[in-house]
């Protein structure tokens, strides 16, 4: 369960892929589209508001029933819109929603390296936000084989 309804911290950052392509958001026909693209040098990168939440992780291994804490994030590129996992379509979408946010808007934050992160679906462990055909998609990761897959690695820059 997520402890408390307020985030422990928030930050504004631009999101880019491991290969330095930018994640951008465009309003089209009253809905937002998400693109993965090379930005022209003079173009400003889109910023995303990352809100960080603590989540207790239950475990049978420790006596108190809690093995540790996870850090969950929500990502909002513009007011009232959040990235959400659509597990049925294996897609990542931007939806307008009110708080409390649905579980599909929460992602477990992984530091794969000090400057690379991955976003794992709260609602579908082992499934991560990734890049597929120049779009964001949900990608199932085999922990034993593809933990370092470049297509699920992202960089955050303030």
């Amino acid at each position: 369960s997520i402890t408390g309804i307020s985030p422990i911290t928030e930050s504004l950052a631009s999101l880019s892929t491991y290969n330095d392509q930018s994640i951008t958001f465009a309003l089209e026909d009253e809905s937002y589209e998400i693109y993965v693209e090379d930005l022209k040098k003079d173009k400003k990168k889109d910023k995303v508001l990352l809100s960080y939440y603590e989540s207790q992780h239950p475990s049978s291994e420790s006596g108190d029933g809690v093995d540790g804490k996870m850090l969950m994030v929500t990502l909002s590129p513009t007011k009232d819109f959040w990235l959400q996992a659509n597990n049925k379509e294996h897609s990542v979408e931007l939806h307008k929603c009110e708080k409390p946010l649905p579980d599909q808007a929460f992602f477990v934050l992984h530091n794969r390296s000090f400057n690379c992160v991955s976003f794992e679906c709260k609602t579908d462990p082992g499934v991560f936000i990734g890049v597929k055909d120049n779009h964001l998609a949900l990608i199932k990761v085999d922990y034993s084989e593809n933990l370092g897959s470049e297509n699920i690695l992202f960089k955050l820059s303030e």
């Epitope: 603590e54 093995d67 804490k69 390296s113 933990l147």
Partner: antibody, heavy 122, light 107 residues
Framework: EVQLVESGGGLVQPGTSLKLSCLAS????????MTWIRQAPGKGLEWIAS????????YYPDSVKGRFTISRDDAKSTLYLQMNSLRSEDTATYYC???????????????WGQGTLVTVSS | DIQMTQSPASLSASLGETVSIECLAS??????LAWYQQKSGKSPQLLIY???RLQDGVPSRFSGSGSGTRFSLKISGMQPEDEADYFC?????????FGSGTKLEIK
């Protein structure tokens, strides 16, 4: 209960090597970044090395880069620090620490071992 | 590297007194700032993380605040067991760096 127990410290001569171990228990070891931090006698704290929860990434300050190597054996829930070309300024108590969150570096170090003293002297 | 300048280096306080320790960073960063207490001959203990979040089991007289480059630790009502060294630490950028410490003694 989370426990971190360091071992392997001792008195060594300059230029020699030493390997420290840290046995972890009470938590799922392979879900956490692990870090070595040292403290010279009567001095402050110094970050020495970190390793990702996957073991795929390692990080060091310039003071030990190329001489020290951090590694982990998840099957044994053990963290290691291989220290080569030791210098007198490496004399310190070495602490094994665990990150605050699964998979993550954020939030400081809530768990520390008791420390193991390394003395480098001729 | 981010330098963490901690002040004062030492401090004497009477029992019940409110005490503040400050950490000044050489450059601004997100709030990945922790405070530790280290009693003589013991390992450090995490008091505060994320600049202001109290670690489980730590008395509520300890509090943290600040953002950007300026952070502080406050002890509201000094107790005998609070006599210790205190260190700040930033975790936003590698290399991870600590403040040089504040020795807090009872007057």
């Amino acid at each position: 209960e989370v426990q971190l127990v360091e071992s392997g410290g001792g008195l060594v001569q300059p230029g020699t090597s030493l390997k420290l171990s840290c046995l972890a228990s009470g938590f799922t070891f392979n879900n956490y970044w692990m870090t070595w931090i040292r403290q010279a006698p009567g001095k402050g704290l110094e970050w020495i090395a970190s390793i990702t929860y996957t073991g795929g990434g390692t990080y060091y300050p310039d003071s030990v880069k190329g001489r020290f190597t951090i590694s982990r054996d998840d099957a044994k829930s053990t963290l290691y620090l291989q220290m080569n070309s030791l210098r007198s300024e490496d004399t310190a108590t070495y602490y094994c620490t665990r990150a605050n969150y699964y998979y993550n570096t954020y939030g400081g170090f809530p768990y520390w071992g008791q420390g193991t003293l390394v003395t480098v002297s001729s | 590297d981010i330098q963490m300048t901690q002040s004062p280096a030492s401090l004497s306080a009477s029992l019940g007194e409110t005490v503040s320790i400050e950490c000044l960073a050489s450059e601004g960063f997100s709030n990945d700032l922790a405070w530790y207490q280290q009693k003589s001959g013991k390992s450090p203990q995490l008091l505060i993380y994320a600049a202001s979040r109290l670690q489980d089991g730590v008395p509520s007289r300890f509090s943290g605040s600040g953002s950007g480059t300026r952070f502080s630790l406050k002890i509201s009502g000094m107790q005998p067991e609070d006599e210790a060294d205190y260190f700040c630490q930033q975790g936003s950028k590698y290399p991870l760096t600590f403040g040089s410490g504040t020795k807090l003694e009872i007057k």
